[in-house]
């Protein structure tokens, strides 16, 4: 049975709160797909089990992504 092609994005709205990288547990980038036509960025925070949807177009978020990927590449051998 084929899956329903209903648009099912995870993010229903975007948070305008700034993200402190030290408060971040993980950052997930979900590419656009047949189920959701836009890129979604979901930050899992260390406290309160908070999942925060971030604006992929925001300069601050683009800088955050750069910082996180730089940190990751430092850690990998």
């Amino acid at each position: 049975v084929p899956l329903s092609r209903t648009v099912r994005c995870t993010c229903i709205s975007i948070s305008n709160q700034p993200v402190n990288p030290r408060s971040l547990e993980k950052l997930e980038i979900i590419p656009a797909s047949q189920f959701c036509p836009r890129v979604e960025i979901i930050a899992t925070m260390k406290k309160k089990g908070e999942k925060r949807c971030l604006n992929p177009e925001s300069k601050a978020i683009k800088n955050l992504l750069k910082a996180v990927s730089k940190e990751r590449s430092k850690r990998s051998p």
């Epitope: 709205s13 948070s15 305008n16 979901i42 406290k47 089990g49 999942k51 925060r52």
Partner: antibody
Framework: EVQLVQSGAEVKKPGESLKISCKGS????????IGWVRQMPGKGLEWMGV????????RYSPSFQGQVTISADKSISTAYLQWSSLKASDTAMYYC????????????????WGQGTLVTVSS | AIQLTQSPSSLSASVGDRVTITCRAS??????LAWYQQKPGKAPKLLIY???SLESGVPSRFSGSGSGTDFTLTISSLQPEDFATYYC?????????FGGGTKVEIK
């Protein structure tokens, strides 16, 4: 209207497997945490674990880790709680519950609850 | 895991009474606390979240306060429909946990 509809009561024997379900409707299922809570007869609420259907992030209480599996199928807006080998001590009411979202952030405290599924394990 | 201790475990009160239930956390949880009401044979119902925010549709006689380790649920004037069991829950850090419950009975 937000609704969480749980599968019906189950009577099982020790050692049997079981999967109970919780179907969400009236909201965007992938966005919200879904949790499972146990209530043994005459006792209080016990937090078992939660799942975020959007990214499959799953967290368990140490008391339930390895004893149960929490999963979700976002294509049919349904969360599951399963056991591979039931014990008499698993006899309880099991509630699923949905988290809360506001301003682009979602949290796993429970704004809406299912009606509960009574699981009885007896030889 | 963070432990939540509710007190008292039960209390008897009359309609119109002011009722206070406390919840103490074994470590600081900021304001990440929710309160629920459960009536016999029913699912719990969210009353308060973030320690003091009243859930939509919940009567204003219910209020919550506190932060850090000490929290309070107050019912300003007890109504017949308020006789139930009340639970606190912390959602500051996993695993989230519930308090043991406080049963509010008719005097």
């Amino acid at each position: 209207e937000v609704q969480l509809v749980q599968s019906g009561a189950e009577v099982k024997k020790p050692g049997e497997s079981l999967k109970i379900s919780c179907k969400g409707s009236g909201y965007n299922f992938p966005s919200y945490w879904i949790g499972w809570v146990r209530q043994m007869p005459g006792k209080g609420l016990e937090w078992m674990g939660v799942i975020s259907p959007g990214d499959s992030d799953t967290r368990y209480s140490p008391s339930f880790q390895g004893q149960v599996t929490i999963s979700a199928d976002k294509s049919i807006s349904t969360a599951y709680l399963q056991w591979s080998s039931l014990k008499a001590s698993d006899t309880a009411m099991y509630y699923c519950a949905r988290g809360y979202c506001s301003g682009g952030s979602c949290y796993p405290f429970f704004q809406y609850w299912g009606q509960g599924t009574l699981v009885t394990v007896s030889s | 895991a963070i432990q939540l201790t509710q007190s008292p475990s039960s209390l008897s009160a009359s309609v119109g009474d002011r009722v206070t239930i406390t919840c103490r956390a074994s470590q600081g949880i900021s304001s990440a606390l929710a309160w629920y009401q459960q009536k016999p044979g029913k699912a719990p119902k969210l009353l308060i979240y973030d320690a003091s925010s009243l859930e939509s549709g919940v009567p204003s006689r219910f209020s919550g306060s506190g932060s850090g380790t000490d929290f309070t649920l107050t019912i300003s004037s007890l109504q017949p429909e308020d006789f139930a069991t009340y639970y606190c829950q912390q959602f500051d850090s996993f695993p989230h946990t519930f308090g043991g419950g406080t049963k509010v009975e008719i005097k």
